[in-house]
């Protein structure tokens, strides 16, 4: 229904705390370089204005759209052109073009320093002094680094953060209470970020139909007892929510997400038997819980998929009458039977089924033509299954760091033109799939592995799009989202690449490496490994292992030495010589 004042409506629906949080996220995601204080000032102004509209919906400007109100605020920021360059040109446009212009200027890789966590005592002091400001800083810092972060979910993570601090700051040993808990939240939030970015990429490049197909498959796996009409309704609503968040309509997105959670909890009987524990929680926890609820038990009496989609004499007639509905039904039926498949795989199978019907229904004897379609799915299913087995075996053998290194070598060989920091980031993220997925029960591994890899590769594509350097990467990133992972997996050594010349300074290290945290040490070593592969793309695994073992030994020796600087300056050149010889 239409409201006289959109801003008053959203303020009333969301309440002041969530309203302010979402407006802060919106501003931080649009203007990623502004300080917290600048954004906090704007948020307060917008909130004060919203309150005047709540008091009187007919007050001046209360009838304006949210994008007009927010955009006018952003465009009034001083020195916009000096700080943001051509983004300032957006302010010459009118709504809704101005908003979409802002959206297109979001930077997936902003040049901001890593978000450093203060030490426990300092953190607890500032949290106790002003919890609201502390959480505001958290929202701002995460949102500006992750401009597509799912806003209502970021509120959930802020709430988690708040609860952890409340609990741990009362403990004697704050550090050992905070560190593992906050590390856990950080890891989950980073995964949430890449997953949501993939959803927005899907909407941006392939539109609503592609996203809705993803939603149908995912929801059908989770709620196999819900009928097709119910799944379609949920998929439509979920598509709307995600579209709003990806489009920067964060207040509408959060409001509609709350509505969807409410609907699901009021209709558990027709959706799933597993929702009750989620539905007992408060709003943010409820919505989060529903988004990752365990799969319902599959109905015991499901007929074979072939009955309606291969053996039925009316297949081509049903397909011709309503293609989208027929294919949607196929995707629903196949997905509810296969919670053990990844969504990407299910969408590839649906695509294969569609291509088969397109071809066969134009022939003289369609049933003879499409009769073998399910058998033709086999290679499509085997490929990711083999991928999971091979990679989980390797992970179990090497551990996370070794597995990351194996992936780093593989991907540097596939796309040696890509910048070393991007390759290292990608390999570290791809390598985490082992820890995340390989320890799961067999039937959960494939969906975990492939859908996570797809999200990470989406980020690789986004970063590469900014500065395209590799034809291999361009080829894989240009196709459909569901074909990306198989495309990257199939890439081999790039034969067109001219190896980088050996530069001694790339492999020269100093004693400061000894005091770095373990993660930073790993990144330094992985940077060297990528550079080695760029120098010798066809180096064998054995050669690379020899060099890296030597390198690790060198670091260990020099970091334990009484005179570290002398050790690094004398032993370093020897290491470089040995590396060159080993790779010759």
């Amino acid at each position: 229904e239409a409201h006289k004042s959109e801003i008053a409506h959203r303020y009333n629906d969301l309440g002041e705390q969530h309203f302010k949080g979402l407006v802060l996220i919106a501003f931080s995601q649009y203007l990623q370089k502004c300080s917290y204080d600048e954004h906090a000032k704007l948020v307060q102004e917008v909130t004060d204005f919203a309150k005047t509209c709540v008091a009187d919906e007919s007050a001046a400007n209360c009838d304006k759209s949210l994008h007009t109100l927010f955009g006018d605020k952003l465009c009034a920021i001083p020195n916009l052109r000096e700080n943001y360059g051509e983004l300032a040109d957006c302010c010459t446009k009118q709504e809704p073009e101005r908003n979409e212009c802002f959206l297109q200027h979001k930077d997936d890789n902003p040049s901001l320093p890593p978000f450093e966590r203060p030490e426990a005592e300092a953190m607890c002091t500032s949290f106790k002094e002003n919890p609201t400001t502390f959480m505001g800083h958290y929202l701002h810092e995460v949102a500006r680094r992750h401009p597509y972060f799912y806003a209502p979910e970021l509120l959930y993570y802020a709430e988690q953060y708040n609860e952890i601090l409340t609990q741990c700051c009362a403990e004697a040993d704050k550090e050992s209470c905070l560190t593992p808990k906050l590390d856990g939240v950080k890891e989950k939030a980073l995964v949430s970020s890449v997953r949501q970015r993939m959803k927005c990429s899907s909407m941006q490049k392939f539109g609503e139909r592609a996203f809705k197909a993803w939603a149908v498959a995912r929801l059908s796996q989770t709620f196999p007892n819900a009928d097709f009409a119910e799944i379609t309704k949920l998929a439509t609503d979920l598509t709307k929510v995600n579209k709003e968040c990806c489009h920067g309509d964060l207040l509408e997105c959060a409001d509609d997400r709350a509505e969807l959670a409410k609907y699901m909890c009021e209709n558990q009987a027709t959706i799933s038997s597993k929702l009750q524990t989620c539905c007992d929680k408060p709003l943010l926890k409820k919505a989060h819980c529903l988004s990752e609820v365990e799969h319902d038990t599959m109905p015991a009496d499901l007929p074979a998929i072939a009955a309606d989609f291969v053996e039925d004499q009316e297949v081509c007639k049903n397909y011709a009458e309503a293609k989208d509905v027929f294919l949607g039904t196929f995707l629903y039926e196949y997905s509810r039977r296969h919670p053990d498949y990844s969504v990407s795989l299910l969408l590839r199978l649906a695509k294969k089924y569609e291509a088969t019907l397109e071809k066969c229904c134009a022939e003289a004897n369609p049933p003879a033509c499409y009769g073998t379609v399910l058998a033709e799915f086999q290679p499509l299913v085997e490929e990711p299954k083999n991928l999971v087995k091979t990679n989980c075996d390797l992970y179990e053998k090497l551990g996370e760091y070794g597995f990351q290194n194996a992936i780093l070598v593989r991907y540097t060989q596939k796309a040696p033109q890509v910048s070393t920091p991007t390759l290292v980031e990608a390999a570290r993220n791809l390598g985490r799939v082992g820890t995340k997925c390989c320890t799961l029960p067999e039937d959960q591994r494939l969906p975990c592995v492939e859908d996570y890899l797809s999200a990470i590769l989406n980020r690789v594509c986004l970063l590469h799009e900014k500065t395209p350097v590799s034809e291999h990467v361009t080829k894989c990133c240009s196709g459909s989202l569901v074909e990306r992972r198989p495309c990257f997996s199939a890439l081999t050594v790039d034969e067109t690449y001219v190896p980088k010349e050996f530069k001694a300074e790339t492999f020269t290290f100093h004693s400061d490496i000894c005091t770095l945290p373990e993660k930073e040490k790993q990144i330094k070593k992985q940077t060297a490994l990528a550079e080695l592969v760029k120098h010798k793309p066809k180096a064998t695994a054995e050669q690379l292992k020899t060099v890296m073992d030597d390198f690790a030994q060198f670091l260990d020796t020099c970091c334990k030495a009484a005179d570290k600087d002398t050790c690094f300056s004398t032993e370093g050149p020897n290491l470089v010589t040995r590396c060159k010889d080993a790779l010759a």
Epitope: P96, E97, E100, L103, Q104, C200, M203, Q204, K205, F206, G207, E208, R209, A210, K243, C246, H247, K323, D324
Partner: nanobody
Framework: EVQLVESGGGLVQPGGSLRLSCAAS????????MGWFRQAPGKEREFVSA????????YYADSVKGRFTISRDNSKNTLYLQMNSLRAEDTAVYYC??????????????????WGQGTLVTVSS
């Protein structure tokens, strides 16, 4: 393949009305978003209005909100733009466009794969 043919343009006085039509032939289906853009001489092509074929949701540029109305007739596969209270600054060539995927950014011309040839609207006394 989709073909789009606009009609209904012409000369009208300020304050007057016009109704543009866009006949779509070929395989338009429920996932389509249809839109109207315009281009005045020496200016960039700008977004005017759009509608989702599936749910009928509409979008307007601020400059035409309250004066223009977009609508569709599914049975005739036709898109309309009712333009009231026309102003001199509405003078432009009006184009009908179709995005078969309903991509996220509906004001971006590059997201529309199919275009009509355009119809000229002149608002002058």
């Amino acid at each position: 393949e989709v073909q789009l043919v606009e009609s209904g343009g012409g000369l009208v006085q300020p304050g007057g009305s016009l109704r543009l039509s866009c006949a779509a032939s070929g395989s338009t289906d429920s996932a389509y978003r249809m839109g109207w853009f315009r281009q005045a001489p020496g200016k960039e092509r700008e977004f005017v209005s759009a509608i989702n074929w599936s749910d009928g949701r509409t979008y307007y540029a601020d400059s035409v909100k309250g004066r223009f109305t977009i609508s569709r007739d599914n049975s005739k596969n036709t898109l309309y733009l009712q333009m009231n209270s026309l102003r001199a600054e509405d003078t432009a060539v009006y184009y009908c466009a179709a995005d078969p995927d309903s991509r996220l950014y509906y004001t971006v011309p590059q997201n529309y794969d199919y275009w009509g040839q355009g119809t000229l609207v002149t608002v002058s006394s």
